[in-house]
Interface confidence: low
């Protein structure tokens, strides 16, 4: 962008520039290329030798510019077209400038010479005109632009030196170049004056537009000597909740029903299914009533809900064990992280309230977090009613105020073999016999018909065991070796069959010596 400091064509009255000597440059009304009347300066003292004619503009304020450009429109008479012209005829003139802090020039100051004036250049015509051209009003107007700098004072004067030409200075425009205020890469760069040299690059620091933030390096844009912005460094991007519109010059809040979770170039996106925004500029969408977002769910994922209950439960009871199978819920809640929990309630033999099952119940593969729709449950009590709830849960179950949906199944366990005998003790012993007694199993699961006792010598293998039956919970085992250790195990039998053997118990018969001693102790004194 060019900012004009002075333009001679806009003058409505005399320009009134200073000339030296008075016989040199002359202000006359002339015409521009469009035949508009303008104020011009002419000089044509070609027949007089040693010409040194100066023309000085009025004081021109710099207005912060560092480099000044001067556009001159002029026409120069072709020396060869002037009859009997002396060799001193020139087709060029010189351009000078002089810096000052205020308008201090007089008729004699600054001196009319190259020092103190600073020469910018010798200006030559690209085309000169001949007498014929003038007569036909065809003017060959030259346009030349020269620049100088750096300038640092408040202002300056320009001077044009003629040294023997025939020319007309038609227009003089003085300007500087600046880069305009611009919004680029999401940043505002304020109007910046070009540098002091033609090759200067002036760095302008940008500030992010409203609702944008810096992404990378300091936001910089360079203004070149021609008043053009070069490629920017760094950028700003609309922050979360805002999107770029109007060619990236505005960060607009996401319209209602849309959101943007992160800073970046991307546009706002529609709220995922089952969510909505409550205002403009949303960084996330709020789930509708009854729908939730798990902690690790991305913000662009639909809101989901809890699953419905499992369906079509099938139970298969075998004595005190149970296989449960079911089909998945009709509605998974829109999620893929569905698992099942099993809640076991024991209802005794059918009367009274149910209670949570004890820790002795076994679940395979596990009670909670089942991924497959089946479970094997064992170690239940015989002849007992149970209620099993199969809960369907997913990643948002914890967020819901409602309990998980479940399917319920009631079962009753069958007759089962008795549990193991837990305690066995020795009543008496001799060199070849041991009398044992034991308590009834904790869970007889019916009427005990009899017991089976298995025993073998500790030094021998279990394969050598002998089994004997006893209708009561006491038995005397005969025919044993003196002083030997025997291993004993007992199990109970009901109509449902044998229970598990008890743990191994070790008892020893008397040695001969012990037996003799015990007899002596029993003899009367």
């Amino acid at each position: 962008v060019e900012e004009t400091l002075m333009d001679s064509t806009t003058a409505t009255a005399e320009l009134g520039w200073m000339v030296h000597p008075p016989s040199g440059w002359e202000e006359v009304s002339g015409y521009d290329e469009n035949m508009n009347t303008i104020r011009t300066y002419q000089v044509c003292n070609v027949f007089e030798s040693s010409q040194n004619n100066w023309l000085r503009t009025k004081f021109i304020r710099r207005r912060g510019a560092h480099r000044i450009h001067v556009e001159m429109k002029f026409s120069v008479r072709d020396c060869s077209s002037i009859p009997s012209v002396p060799g001193s005829c020139k087709e060029t003139f010189n351009l000078y400038y002089y810096e000052a802090d205020f308008d201090l020039a007089t008729k004699t100051f600054p001196n009319w010479m190259e020092n103190p004036w600073v020469k910018v250049d010798t200006i030559a015509a690209d085309e000169s005109f001949s007498q014929v051209d003038l007569g036909g009003r065809v003017m060959k107007i030259n346009t030349e632009v020269r620049s100088f700098g750096p300038v640092s004072r408040n202002g300056f004067y320009l001077a044009f030196q003629d040294y023997g030409g025939c020319m007309s200075l038609i227009a003089v425009r003085v300007f500087y170049r600046k880069c305009p205020r611009i919004i680029q890469n999401g940043a505002i760069f304020q109007e910046t004056l070009s540098g002091a040299e033609s090759t200067s690059l002036v760095a302008a620091r940008g500030s992010c537009i409203a609702n944008a933030e810096e992404v990378d390096v300091p936001i910089k844009l360079y203004c070149n000597g021609d008043g053009e912005w070069l490629v920017p460094i760094g950028r700003c991007m609309c922050k979360a909740g805002f999107e770029a519109v109007e060619n990236g010059t505005v960060c607009r809040g996401c319209p209602s029903g849309t959101f943007k979770a992160n800073q970046g170039d991307e546009a706002c996106t529609h709220c995922p299914i089952n969510s909505r925004t409550t205002s403009e500029g949303a960084t996330n969408c709020v789930c509708r009533n009854g729908y939730y977002r798990a902690d690790l769910d991305p913000l662009d994922m639909p809101c989901t809900t809890i699953p419905s209950a499992p369906q079509a439960v099938i139970s298969s009871v075998n004595e005190t064990s149970l296989m449960l199978e079911w089909t998945p819920p009709r509605d998974s809640g829109g999620r893929e992280d569905l698992v099942y929990n099993i809640i076991c309630k024991s209802c005794g033999s059918g009367r009274g309230a149910c209670t949570r099952c004890g820790d002795n119940v076994q679940y395979a593969p596990r009670q909670l977090g089942l991924t497959e729709p089946r479970i094997y449950i064992s170690d239940l009590l015989a002849h007992t009613q149970y209620t099993f709830e199969i809960q369907a849960v997913n990643g948002v179950t914890d967020q819901s105020p409602f309990s998980p949906q479940f399917a319920s199944v009631n079962i009753t366990t069958n007759q089962a073999a008795p549990s193991a005998v837990s305690i066995m003790h020795q009543v008496s012993r001799t060199v070849d016999s041991i009398t044992l007694s034991w308590s009834q199993p904790d869970q007889p699961n019916g009427v005990i018909l009899d017991y089976e006792l298995q025993y073998y010598e500790k030094e021998l293998s279990e394969y050598n065991a002998t089994a004997i039956k006893s209708p009561t919970n006491t038995v005397t085992v005969q025919g044993l070796k003196a002083g030997a250790i025997y291993v004993f195990q007992v199990r109970a039998r009901t109509v449902a069959g044998y229970g598990r053997y008890s743990g191994k118990m070790y008892f020893q018969t008397m040695t001969e010596a012990e037996y003799q001693t015990s007899i002596k102790e029993k003899l009367p004194l």
Epitope: R205, D216, V217
Partner: antibody
Framework: QVQLQQSGAELAKPGASVKMSCKAS????????MHWVKQRPGQGLEWIGF???????TDYNQKFKDKATLTVKSSNTAYMQLSRLTSEDSAVYYC?????????????WGQGTTLTVSA | DIVMTQSPSSLSVSAGEKVTMNCKSS????????????LAWYQQKPGQPPKLLIY???TRESGVPDRFTGSGSGTDFTLTISSVQAEDLAVYYC?????????FGAGTKVEIK
């Protein structure tokens, strides 16, 4: 907590080069620019330049453009190499971080690396 | 480059007194886009690295005692210590964070009588 741990003191001869390090911990290394500042004995602070660890982009004070070279390694470490050493380079050199967004200042500084250039 | 001029270069005060130091920049440090002044104040105690006290001309860094206050805009800035303590013995630097190259003032040395 945030820490910038700089390498130990260096003694170098005129004309030589040195490379000092600054290991960052306690924060996301790529979220902050790493700046370097020079302080001659009993003098003020001079900004050398910075590097953006996430892109490797550098910007230097023109005065140090031919003197300092800033680099980063993925191991949360920034480096500054000083070349063609003279006695004028004898100073304490600090690394300091500056947040990329919203916050305009250098909030944590290393303890400094002392460089002595002597024949 | 922006020149930062600090005054006074040093001052000596008694504990409990109010201390005011000034910082003048050769160009405005006000970012017209976000109306923030890109100026920071640092404290440097002997043998230690500088420590950030104030950023954005007036925002106190977390953990900095509230006796430290920054003010000013454009080219003129002030750091005030409302009631100086013995541990405030240090050199205080202002810093242009507006334009590259970043520049620091020459510092104001605070001595405790």
């Amino acid at each position: 907590q945030v820490q910038l741990q700089q390498s130990g003191a260096e003694l170098a001869k005129p004309g030589a080069s040195v490379k000092m390090s600054c290991k960052a911990s306690g924060y996301t290394f790529t979220s902050y620019w790493m700046h370097w500042v020079k302080q001659r004995p009993g003098q003020g602070l001079e900004w050398i330049g910075f590097i953006n660890p996430s892109t490797g982009y550098t910007d230097y004070n023109q005065k140090f453009k031919d003197k300092a070279t800033l680099t980063v390694k993925s191991s949360n470490t920034a480096y500054m190499q000083l070349s063609r050493l003279t006695s004028e380079d004898s100073a304490v050199y600090y690394c300091t971080r500056r947040l990329k967004l919203l916050r305009y200042a250098m909030d944590y500084w290393g303890q400094g690396t002392t460089l002595t250039v002597s024949a | 480059d922006i020149v930062m001029t600090q005054s006074p270069s040093s001052l000596s005060v008694s504990a409990g007194e109010k201390v005011t130091m000034n910082c003048k920049s050769s160009q405005s440090l006000l970012n017209s886009g976000n109306q923030e002044n890109y100026l920071a104040w640092y404290q440097q105690k002997p043998g230690q690295p500088p420590k950030l006290l104030i950023y954005g001309a007036s925002t106190r860094e977390s953990g900095v005692p509230d006796r430290f206050t920054g003010s000013g805009s454009g080219t003129d800035f002030t750091l005030t210590i409302s009631s100086v303590q013995a541990e405030d013995l240090a050199v205080y630097y202002c810093q242009n964070d507006h334009s590259y190259p970043f520049t620091f003032g020459a510092g104001t040395k605070v001595e405790i009588k």
